[in-house]
């Protein structure tokens, strides 16, 4: 417990003290006093730097005294023999003796009383940083008006904080500026902008004058700017050292000033302004900007368009462009979208005809469409080579996004006819040589195939039957090669609008316009033994010639059979109409000059006995093609015959093309068109 | 006459991987672009995959990206779905269907059903 | 992605009414892309119409199909027995995926 004062005696005094002894006093005063340590008495054996026997002042880690030998009082009027003045408030007092004493020494007494210090001037570190007052137990500091006492209650400064700026345009100083700056103090400034803006501050080298950097470079007065997590400075010296231009990316700035005790200057001053955030001119591939500007600032906003070819896509939509605006942030918005090769997909496929596989589906990538040849042929041109656009669209030269069309190939046997063995007036003959022939059931009867969709006929051979059974594809009618064969099922039958309908068929004696098309429910796929005729063209090229060579085929009666099982075939000159007019009707049913001729005949045969008969009726009399010489055309339709093995007459087709052109045109499904 | 015909549908655990065929006939089928399309029992029609004719670009829906594999042999007129990590949710019948004009499926087969269950 | 709304979910009709289906995407689809299928309980589904308007193969002409844009159509004109079904309608867009409608169950009322 420390005490305002208090008596050290030797052991024994005022007896003399033994050999042998070292004993030690601990002197405490209050807090705020120094001890004035003095001794009264003094007999103790002397030696060179007292080192037998010796009383020891010890003060923290200092000596502050040894003493030996006797003393007495300069001053009669004071008993003090020796003294000790210490600024602090604790002393250590140490008596040592050592074995033997040559004489009897009585040793020390000694006083301590607590003194008053004076923190202001005892002290090489002044406690105060601008004002010192003491008093009995301590002091206390003070400050020059203007500046404030801080919480360590010892240093001073001036209260430059928490100044926040928040107009757009603003200038700030060090305290007291162009007079020097407090000395000790923290100044702290807050410049706070709406979102957007960043802060940019700009300085003169001359307004900037502020304590030099020490030896090491660091330095002892500062000016510094933080501005999120980036920090401009420490800066200190004469002249601004850093750029006179500072952009801070942000839109908070906190300006710290912080001085110490010495060596004050005239300080300094800024001003600052928001500039518009900017934003930076993005590289963006395969793309322009708009407007295209040399600077971007907050809430600009730019259309970004893809260049031909490129697309944006977000959420699997493609776009053209997008719209991006410059944030607070200083970051484009839709940063994320980007420009890229537009992707045509997978090409659609097309019936009858095939695309091969493209290396790449992006733009610019070449895909060619095939036919099946050679049964099919790309009717409305273009090559079909399409290549992908960007508009996201496989696009031809010609025909632009529309597909290629697969057509069936027309009046191209797989195989010529050729006249073999003669078989009574005509040749066996395989379906390939004909692959347009149609096999009618009932009543036994022919056809030619014109289209995928559409059958040839005679009128008289589907009046009687509207939903008639037919087959393509087989050499053979017989009954097991049928059911392998192709069966067409009919859609619709429709029959010349010149056509007259008797309520007696087998009276008729007139057979113009003995034509009919039947209409298929499916489409015919086309091969080596199914295919096509051509039709007429409407050019005077296609007028008939007497003498001029067709072909018939079919199941018709022979001379040994009533009905053919393999198709038969025949090569027959064309007539003029009066050979046919001057043959004898076999079984007629009228008078002969009844029967009715008209130009829409065609007379043909007459020669080696080869002609057409019952059973062939609608089947074609195809002639090679004035035009294309490798392609037969239906020229006529087995019609009627005075007398099989003479002459037969035969539709002339020609007279019909615009007939069945229309009747084709309006009832075709939309798949077909 | 085009037909489809699937196969290799069944019961499997969760995390178990089945095989799906779809075998072609009555049409070139290496001309096709072709697809997988499942219905959940009661449910509506959800795409699955396509594959071009040649089978070089596939595409998929993003629930079975990385889990299934559209493939085809043009040799053997053979669609495949190879499905691994299956989940409850795959339950459904598998249909394989033929690509047409503008992608519309023109010809379906019967479907193979695929169940999903512990 | 696309969607695909089908409306009503349910039609009730007699036969000889006449039936409007209603099929609205998200986004514009291109006609050339859009089709519809019939499928009738424990059967797979079947082309009906494709590219908005064109009839498939063996589709009675008593269908038809119309629309651009986002809205598309199938109508029936006169309601045979043989047409109550549920009718789906799909769209391709080459990014992908391809998307179908959620169904409209056509009933005998």
């Known amino acids: 417990e420390p005490t305002m004062y208090g008596e050290i005696l030797s052991p024994n005094y005022p007896q003399a003290y033994p050999s042998e002894v070292e004993k030690s006093w601990d002197i405490e005063v209050p807090e705020g006093y120094g001890i004035h340590l003095y001794f009264t008495h003094l007999d103790i054996e002397l030696s060179e730097n007292c080192a037998y026997d010796s009383v020891q002042i010890i003060s923290g880690d200092t000596e502050e005294g040894r003493l030996c030998g006797q003393r007495s009082s300069n001053n009669p009027h004071s008993p003090i023999v020796e003294e000790f003045q210490v600024p602090y408030n604790k002393l250590q007092v140490i008596f040592k003796s050592d074995f033997s004493n040559e004489e009897r020494f009585t040793g020390f007494a000694a006083y301590y009383v607590a003194t008053d210090i004076n923190e202001c001037t005892d002290f090489v570190d002044v406690p105060c940083s601008h004002f010192c007052n003491n008093f009995i137990g301590g002091y206390f500091c003070s400050c020059p008006p203007e500046y404030f006492l801080h919480d360590d209650m010892k240093n001073c400064g001036v209260n430059c904080s928490g100044d926040v700026f928040t107009a757009l345009i603003g200038e700030i100083a060090s305290p007291n500026y162009p007079k020097p700056y407090p000395e000790n103090s923290r100044c702290e400034y807050q410049i706070r902008l709406e979102k957007g803006f960043q802060v940019v501050v700009t300085l003169r080298r001359e307004d900037f004058d502020v304590e030099a950097a020490d030896s090491a470079g660091n330095c002892l007065d500062s000016l510094v700017f933080v501005a999120g997590d980036r920090q401009f400075g420490p800066y200190c010296g004469h002249g601004f050292p850093g750029p006179l231009n500072i952009e801070t990316k942000s839109n908070a700035l906190d300006i710290i000033f912080q001085t110490d005790l010495t060596g004050q200057k005239k300080g300094w001053k800024l001003r600052y302004h928001g500039d518009p955030m900017p934003c930076p001119k993005e590289d963006t591939p395969n793309s322009v900007w708009e407007p295209a500007k040399a600077k971007y600032v907050f809430r600009d906003v730019v259309q970004i368009t893809c260049l031909d070819g490129f697309e944006v896509v977000e959420g699997r939509v493609g776009a053209t462009s997008f719209y991006s605006t410059c944030q607070s942030n200083g970051k484009w918005s839709n940063s994320k979208l980007k420009c890229q090769p537009v992707d045509c997909g997978i090409p659609e496929s097309i019936e009858n005809g095939k695309v091969e596989d493209p290396e790449s589906t992006l733009f610019g990538s070449v895909i060619r469409y095939t036919c099946e040849e050679p049964y099919y042929y790309m009717e409305n041109g273009g090559g079909g080579e399409y290549h992908c656009a960007g508009n996201g669209s496989w696009v031809n030269e010609v025909l632009g996004p529309e597909l290629p069309k697969c057509v069936p190939v027309c009046g191209v046997p797989r195989e010529p006819f050729e006249e073999k063995q003669r078989i009574i007036g005509g040749s066996d003959a395989d379906i390939k040589n004909f692959p347009w022939q149609v096999f009618f059931d009932n009543p036994w009867a022919g056809g030619a195939l014109i289209n995928e969709y559409w059958v040839l006929t005679a009128a008289h051979v589907v009046e009687g039957n509207r939903e008639p059974t037919m087959y393509v594809g087989s050499t053979s009618v017989q009954t097991s090669r049928l059911a392998k064969s192709k069966m067409l099922t009919p859609e619709h039958v429709f029959i010349h609008p010149g056509w007259k309908l008797l309520e007696v068929p087998e009276g008729r004696t007139n057979f113009d316009n003995d034509i009919a098309l039947v209409r298929l429910k499916d489409p015919v796929k086309m091969g080596p033994t199914v295919s096509p005729i051509c039709l007429p063209g409407t050019s005077s090229d296609y007028n008939l010639m007497d003498g001029d060579l067709g072909l018939i085929s079919g199941w018709g009666r022979t001379e040994k059979r009533d009905r053919a099982v393999r198709l038969k075939a025949a090569r027959l000159p064309v007539a003029p109409l009066r050979k046919c007019k001057e043959v004898k009707v076999e079984k007629p049913t009228a008078d002969a000059e009844a029967y009715v001729f008209t130009p829409n005949m065609i007379c043909a045969g007459g020669e080696k006995g080869m002609d057409s008969c019952k059973g062939d009726s609608g089947g074609a009399f195809a002639v090679q093609d004035p035009n294309d010489k490798t392609k037969f055309y239906a020229a006529g339709l087995v019609s009627w015959g005075p007398q099989c093995g003479t002459y037969g007459l035969y539709t002339r087709v020609k007279n019909y093309v615009d007939w069945i052109m229309k009747t084709m045109q309006e009832n075709s499904t939309p798949r077909e068109d | 006459e085009v037909m489809l015909v699937e196969s290799g549908g069944g019961l499997v655990k969760p995390g178990g991987s089945l095989r799906l065929s779809c075998a072609a006939s009555?049409?070139?089928?290496?001309?096709?672009?072709m697809s997988w399309v499942r219905q959940a029992p009661g449910k509506g029609l959800e795409w699955v995959a396509t594959?071009?004719?040649?089978?070089?670009?596939?595409y998929y829906l993003d629930s079975v990206k990385g889990r299934f594999t559209i493939s085809r042999d043009n040799s053997k007129d053979t669609l495949y779905l190879q499905m691994n990590s299956l989940r409850a949710e795959d339950t459904a019948l598998y249909y394989c269907?033929?690509?047409?004009?503008?992608?519309?499926?023109?010809?379906w087969g019967q479907g193979t059903l695929v169940t999903v269950s512990s | 992605q696309i969607v695909l709304t089908q409306s009503p979910a349910t039609l009730s009709l007699s036969p000889g009414e006449r039936a409007t289906l209603s099929c609205t995407a998200s986004?514009?689809?291109?006609?050339?892309?859009l089709h519809w299928y019939q499928q009738k309980p424990g059967k797979a589904p079947k082309l009906w119409i494709y590219?908005?308007?064109n009839l498939a193969s063996g589709v009675p002409s008593r269908f038809s199909g119309s629309g651009s844009g986002t809205d598309y159509t199938l109508t029936i004109s006169s309601l045979q027995p043989e047409d109550f079904a549920t009718y789906y309608c799909?769209?391709?867009?080459?990014?992908?995926?391809?998307?179908f409608g959620q169904g409209t169950k056509l009933e005998i009322k």
């Open positions: 269907a033929r690509l047409f004009t503008g992608h519309a499926m023109d010809y």
């Open positions: 009555g049409f070139t089928f290496s001309n096709y672009a």
């Open positions: 590219s908005t308007s």
């Open positions: 986004s514009s689809v291109s006609s050339s892309y």
């Open positions: 594959i071009s004719s040649g089978g070089s670009h596939t």
């Open positions: 799909h769209q391709y867009y080459r990014l992908h995926p391809i998307t």
